[in-house]
């Protein structure tokens, strides 16, 4: 059989190196050797290129070498398959060495921020030894912040054959670490060097960029003092590098400007004991360039009544996310507040706030999050300074079986009736949302029985039991993940019903 | 415009040699092969060998093989060929050419210089 | 080698008249034929190259075909300046080998 007629030629000149074309089939099914037929210098010399020795046959490529590689040139290339059946030759195919060069990536030898210019790099590199003098040369510069998996990039051409070569690189964010790399190609050619090596730079400081901030309102004391927690965070969009060197916070109360108070902290949180009345609060942070534009917040009076304008909330799983929506009656509302912390036994140790706008969900990583806890998730309607009612919902990002069956007694033991008493599970040996609770019993040396009842259900009557018998019986707090059984208590049903008992005494 | 110019005519003895020459105007030989032709009177065309005027790599055909010597000179952009033991066969018009083998630009002969072989 | 066997050597032929010219490859040579033009002490002209493609400046009366090892030029209607003597050449394989030629000549 004679080999297929050679397809899809692909050709390409690496600069200095060679040139190379590989085609299609990559195998035959019998031994196959290739002659590749090329014209060069314009059309004025030819020569083969053969992959008839041992080592090379039946390979689907073949390199052409300096110093007979003409550039600028046009290459015409026809490739000859022969096995011992004969010969097929592909169709003449035409290569214009400008338009298939690829050269060696340019080397950045520095990324640096230009003093007084702000949101600015500038890159400086090396042109690839390896390319054409005269020719202009194409870029792309690829850069991500140092934290991000995101690349964005910028095209731009250099006409210079000037060894070192600069671009700015702007509308960057200040004090942020950003990784670049650059590669290049002849104007004219498809292809394109590889990547050079990455190069990290810095942007300039500049004061801080705002911040977030909010607050957790508590009972009122005995004495009529309300403690109001603040919290603030760099607010979304600020440079990861940004250091605040401190924190001014002034608050007084609304209409009263006079009775001002003011402090200054180097934490993210303060604790506010205000009165009754509605107050204004004020923080901003500094650094040695500046100071970050004002964060306002509204501490409402203690009578005051708040809107509510949540009606519904779910929570769900995706495979690596949790989402919450929310329904609102207030179209007018497009900024929320969302609170999640862990529902544990005692304080919760973290607290986690986050703004949303113009959107009524709110999505976190699942690996943001604790597998088996709990967490409590509150959103609050913010309605320009005017902050509404929360809407809470309770949410597992994977659960498990409980680390604990429920503690069991059992009481009034009668003839033929028990009833069973257990505990909750501690919320920290929970795992997951209690669906039911089993109640497994069973006589000795006879049948298991089981009774499935809801999660609200602490207490069972079990009816029909054998008098005087011994019964082992232990209950099964379930969640989605699957049931954990608690201690196995026994116990005996009665002879005789137990207001007879005390007459009825054996001696 | 590329021009391959040939000179005059030679005549020469049995037993001798003669260089010829080929002087390219218009076009750098280092970018092309210089093949030469020759036809002897009232005969065809033969075709004698070429070279690589970058590395001085030569092919010849079999019956030219040890007549003939192709040469060049990349700084006075010439080529030449040598035919040494002369016969009275070897009485032909002998042609410098470039062929143009992708067909992007045409061939390019000399006019041919008649080398006569006599004593 | 590769033999170019080339027919007829010579043809008497009147103007106007459809002319073909044939050459016989002794082995495979693809599309690597030549066919050229030599008028009486000039040099060979190039007329059709890659075996059916016209040169550039070569009236389109010239055609050039291929089928299988037989190589043809054809001149559909012949002029004065057409009567010379036409050669193929093989350029696919060391050494080149030229047909014998073919003489047209006038009736």
């Known amino acids: 059989v004679l080999p297929a007629k050679p397809e899809n030629i692909s050709c390409i000149f690496y600069y200095e190196e060679n040139f190379t074309c590989t085609w299609s089939p990559e195998k035959e099914a019998s031994y196959t050797w290739y002659k590749v037929k090329r014209t060069y210098s314009y059309g004025y010399k030819s020569d083969i290129c053969s992959t008839d020795n041992s080592t090379r046959g039946n390979h689907a490529s073949c390199s052409f070498l300096p110093p007979t590689i003409t550039n600028p040139d046009n290459y015409t290339i026809q490739v000859e398959a022969q096995n011992a059946d004969g010969i097929m030759k592909s169709d003449i195919t035409y290569w214009n060495l400008d338009a298939i060069m690829k050269i060696e990536p340019p080397e950045i030898f520095s990324v640096k921020s230009v003093l007084g210019i702000k949101r600015m790099l500038q890159i400086k590199w090396i042109r690839p030894v390896l390319a054409p003098h005269s020719s202009t040369l194409k870029y792309t510069l690829r850069f991500r912040t140092i934290n991000s998996a995101y690349w964005m990039e910028v095209n731009f051409t250099k006409e210079d054959i000037d060894r070192d070569e600069t671009y700015n690189l702007t509308e960057l964010q200040a004090f942020t670490e950003y990784v670049m790399t650059l590669r290049c190609a002849p104007a004219e050619s498809m292809f394109w060097s590889g990547w050079s090596q990455e190069k990290v730079g810095t942007t300039e400081e500049e004061a801080p960029y705002g911040l977030d901030l909010w607050r957790v309102l508590k009972p009122a004391m005995v004495d009529g003092r309300r403690p109001v927690q603040l919290m603030w965070k760099k607010a979304t969009g600020a440079p990861v590098l940004e250091k605040a060197l401190g924190y001014n916070i002034w608050y007084f109360p609304e209409n009263n400007t006079n009775l001002t108070e003011t402090v200054n902290t180097t934490n993210q949180t303060h604790e506010l004991y205000l009165g009754g009345k509605t107050y204004w609060v004020y923080v901003v942070s500094y650094n040695s360039l500046g100071e970050s534009p004002v964060a306002t917040l509204r501490i409402p009076a203690l009578n005051e009544k708040t809107f509510q304008c949540i009606e519904a909330m779910q929570a769900c799983l995706t495979q690596d996310q949790l989402v919450v929506e929310w329904q609102s009656s207030a179209p007018e509302v497009d900024t929320w507040m969302v609170e999640w912390f862990p529902d544990v036994d005692s304080e919760p140790s973290s607290f986690s706030w986050e703004s949303v706008s113009q959107a009524r969900n709110w999505t976190i990583q699942k690996d943001e999050l604790k597998p088996l806890w709990c967490y409590n998730i509150s959103v609050y309607p913010v309605l320009r300074d005017r902050v509404g009612q929360p809407y809470s919902t309770q949410a597992y990002v994977q659960e498990g079986i409980p680390s604990a069956g429920p503690v069991t007694q059992a009481d009034s033991i009668g003839v033929k009736t028990v009833t069973i008493t257990w505990k909750e599970i501690p919320k920290s040996k929970r795992n997951g949302f209690i669906k039911n609770y089993t109640i497994f019993y069973q006589a000795e040396d006879g049948k298991e029985f089981s009774k499935t009842v809801n999660s609200n259900i602490l207490q069972y009557r079990l009816e029909s039991l054998t008098r005087r018998t011994s019964y082992s019986l232990q209950v099964m707090a379930s969640t989605n993940a699957g049931g954990t059984n608690g201690t196995k208590i026994n116990f005996k049903t009665l002879s005789i019903s137990h207001h007879h008992h005390h007459h009825h005494h054996h001696h | 415009e590329v021009q391959l110019q040939q000179y005059g005519a030679e005549l020469g003895k049995p037993g001798t040699s003669v260089k010829l020459s080929c002087k390219v105007s218009?076009?750098?030989?280092?970018?092309?092969?210089m093949h030469w032709v020759n036809q002897r009177p009232g005969k065809g065309l033969e075709w004698i060998g070429r070279?690589?005027?970058?590395?001085?790599?030569?092919i010849y055909s079999e019956k030219f093989k040890s007549k003939a010597t192709l040469t060049a000179d990349t700084s006075s952009n010439t080529a030449y060929m040598q035919l040494s033991q002369l016969k009275s066969d070897d009485t032909a018009i002998y042609f410098c050419?470039?062929?143009?083998?992708?067909?992007?630009?045409?061939?390019?002969w000399g006019q041919g210089v008649m080398v006569t072989v006599s004593s | 080698d590769i033999q170019m066997t080339q027919s007829p050597s010579s043809m008497s032929v009147s103007l106007g008249d459809t002319v073909t010219i044939t050459c016989r490859a002794s082995q495979d040579v693809g599309i690597y034929v030549n066919w050229f033009q030599q008028k009486p002490g000039k040099s060979p002209r190039r007329m059709i190259y890659r075996a059916t493609n016209l040169a550039d400046g070569v009236p389109s009366r010239f055609s050039g075909s291929r089928s299988g090892s037989d190589y043809s030029l054809t001149i559909s209607s012949l002029e004065s300046e057409d009567v010379a003597d036409y050669h193929c050449l093989q350029y696919d394989e060391y050494p080149y080998t030229f047909g014998a030629g073919t003489k047209l000549e006038l009736k």
């Open positions: 050419a470039m062929f143009n083998y992708a067909g992007h630009s045409g061939d390019y």
């Open positions: 070279i690589d005027p970058v590395n001085g790599n030569t």
């Open positions: 218009g076009y750098n030989i280092r970018s092309t092969f």
